[in-house]
Interface confidence: low
């Protein structure tokens, strides 16, 4: 038994042309976790049991918003370690997914949602009680870098974690035949049960007379390898007993099986395993069907009750994208006429129209200058479909019953900077704040609403949470 | 699969208060978002309260203050302490679970709450 940790420590735009946009907004924070999946690397059942050997889920990182004309950075990653127990021994050979989540941190009413950002996947050597190894593996223009080791839990040790350490019978030594137990030199190792010449490295046992060996080697006493033919190729020096001891590049060099596949060298090439959904000889098509629960956001699936039948993802108010993973920007329709400033709530729009201009898009135009008064010496202005009051020096507003300075009175809270505007004021809020007078925070501690259910939906129906 | 089963609906009056609970089997609660919705008779379903895998609750504008949502990993269960109660309040409470294992929702059954005089 022992632990799977895994350490992320950049997450960011990779290098070259073509940086990615920031994953958050100004209008819309948000934060990453991260998801691990493991499965023993040349496990044939692993494309139906994807994560056979474990599974984390990382916190939420912290909150980000993207400073307007700045480079993408880094983004802020979760504290801690992702760690996976595992009971049994440790494989020495594995197969990793992470994927890396995005939380979108909505207004008061529009909640959180989730979308996966990138997905990297890659086939390990790994001993147990070694050294942390580092890795940096790239999704379209993201760079993940992260290390990873395989610890024991005692009284195991070794490689695999399958040697057991007892306490010491005799204060000074271990008995005869026995080694101390590195790095617990005041322990000693169990007597050893295994058939006599089991590999100490490959082999192992869980009962007295056996020797079950590790992923990637076989035989008796499990010494040799459970493939030596690319060492007979000029990739590298081969021996009947020890495999392969200097690999060349190889066919699964680079993993290129897509979307989390785990690759296996064939004679003449390489094959790949692709996980649930996904299929394809490098698992590039998607066999995703409904029964998969492809559409996020609430998003309702038709069709696809087959993997060669597709299916379609209808899309509740707000999301778009073949499975409903993006936020519709609907003011990017600029919806609001004659002026009127646009908010997306999440769950419906509004428009905030210019004095003069009403109705749910500003189209209905106010009453013009007949019977309307302007306070303080100000007079009524026709122009442009829009009637407004000029007013007289040190007055402003709709009526010129403000005082000329509206941002006098410090109306933005939580430290949102203050802007006179035409109509009145704007508030630009400071990251993690939002709201026209900047007065909600986007998360404290579990203030902000949830968006609610499409409507139609029975119990049942596919639909998806955040 | 996971098994949804709520309990603790009833008729209470208004400013009363109940509390539901959401038993689930089959993965630990500590591995699910789980949210409560509730749909009212010839209204659309919307979602009160949500608790994610990290503890982080989040709730409708309109029940912020009055309900509460908790876990106890211990029985698997996950509950609804809704207190000061409105005749609003009146409605089918649903139990909902976002599974990350699997990426699947489900849904429970419904327990039913009205708030009358």
């Known amino acids: 038994a022992g632990v799977f940790e895994l350490q992320i420590h950049s997450f960011g735009p990779g290098p070259g042309p073509g940086a990615p946009r920031s994953p958050c907004s100004a209008r819309l924070p948000c934060r990453l976790f991260f998801r691990v999946c493991l499965k023993p690397g040349l496990s044939e059942e692993a494309a139906e049991s994807p994560c056979a050997l474990g599974a984390a889920l990382s916190a939420r990182g912290p909150v980000y918003t993207e400073q307007p004309g700045a480079p993408a950075p880094d983004l802020p990653l979760p504290d801690g370690l992702l760690q996976v127990p595992f009971r049994d021994a440790w494989p020495g050979t594995f197969s990793f997914i992470i994927e890396t989540w995005r939380e979108e941190l909505g207004d008061q009413i529009g909640g959180p949602a989730w979308s996966l950002l990138a997905r990297v996947a890659g086939r390990r050597r790994l001993a147990a009680g070694g050294p942390w190894a580092r890795d940096i593996q790239r999704a379209g223009a993201w760079e993940l870098r992260f290390s990873y080791r395989a610890r024991c839990e005692p009284p195991a040790v070794g490689t695999a974690c399958t040697r057991l350490c007892r306490p010491r019978s005799a204060p000074s030594r271990c008995g005869p035949g026995l080694r101390p137990c590195a790095p617990l030199e005041d322990e000693c190792e169990a007597p050893l049960v295994c058939r006599a010449g089991c590999s100490p490295e490959h082999g192992f046992c869980e009962q007295p007379g056996e020797c079950r060996c590790l992923e990637g080697w076989t035989g008796p006493l499990c010494t040799v390898p459970v493939s030596t033919s690319s060492c007979l190729s000029p990739r590298g020096p081969s021996s009947a007993t020890t495999g392969c001891l200097v690999p060349g590049p190889g066919p699964c060099d680079g993993n290129p099986c897509a979307n989390g596949g785990s690759c296996s060298e064939t004679p003449r090439s390489f094959e790949c395993t692709c996980p649930r959904g996904f299929y394809g000889l490098r698992c590039e098509v998607s066999g995703v069907t409904c029964a998969d629960g492809p559409c996020f956001n609430g998003g309702l699936c038709v069709g696809g009750a087959d993997p060669d039948s597709a299916y379609i993802c209808h899309c509740p108010p707000g999301f778009q994208g073949s499975n409903c993973e993006k936020r519709v920007d609907r003011c990017s329709l600029q919806p609001c006429r004659n002026g009127g400033l646009c908010l997306d709530l999440g769950h419906a729009l509004r428009c905030r129209c210019r004095a003069g201009f009403a109705g749910p898009r500003c189209e209905h135009d106010l009453d013009d200058c007949a019977g309307r008064a302007c306070a303080n010496g100000g007079t009524c202005v026709e122009g442009g479909g829009a009637h407004r009051c000029s007013c007289a020096l040190g007055f402003g507003g709709r009526d010129c019953r403000e005082r000329a300075d509206p941002c006098a009175a410090r109306p933005c809270a939580h430290g949102g900077r203050c802007y006179a505007h035409f109509s009145g004021l704007v508030c630009a809020c400071a990251p993690g704040y939002m709201g026209a007078r900047c007065e909600f925070p986007v998360h404290p501690d579990g203030a902000s609403a949830l968006p609610a259910a499409p409507p139609g939906l029975r119990p049942g129906d596919p639909q998806r949470y955040l | 699969e996971v098994q949804l089963v709520e309990s603790g609906g009833g008729l209470v009056q208004p400013g009363g208060s109940l509390t539901l609970s959401c038993a689930a089997s089959?993965?630990?609660?500590?591995?699910?978002?789980i949210a409560w919705y509730r749909q009212a008779p010839g209204k659309k379903r919307e979602l009160v309260a949500g608790i994610s895998t990290d503890g982080s609750t989040d709730y409708l504008h309109s029940v912020k203050g009055r309900f509460t949502i908790s876990r106890d990993n211990a029985k698997n269960s996950v509950y609804l302490q809704m207190n000061s109660l409105r005749a609003e309040d009146t409605a089918v409470y649903y139990c909902?679970?976002?599974?990350?294992?699997?990426?699947?929702?489900?849904w429970g059954q419904g327990t039913l709450v009205t708030v009358t005089s």
């Open positions: 089959a993965s630990s609660v500590t591995l699910l978002s």
């Open positions: 909902y679970a976002y599974t990350w294992t699997t990426r699947l929702p489900y």
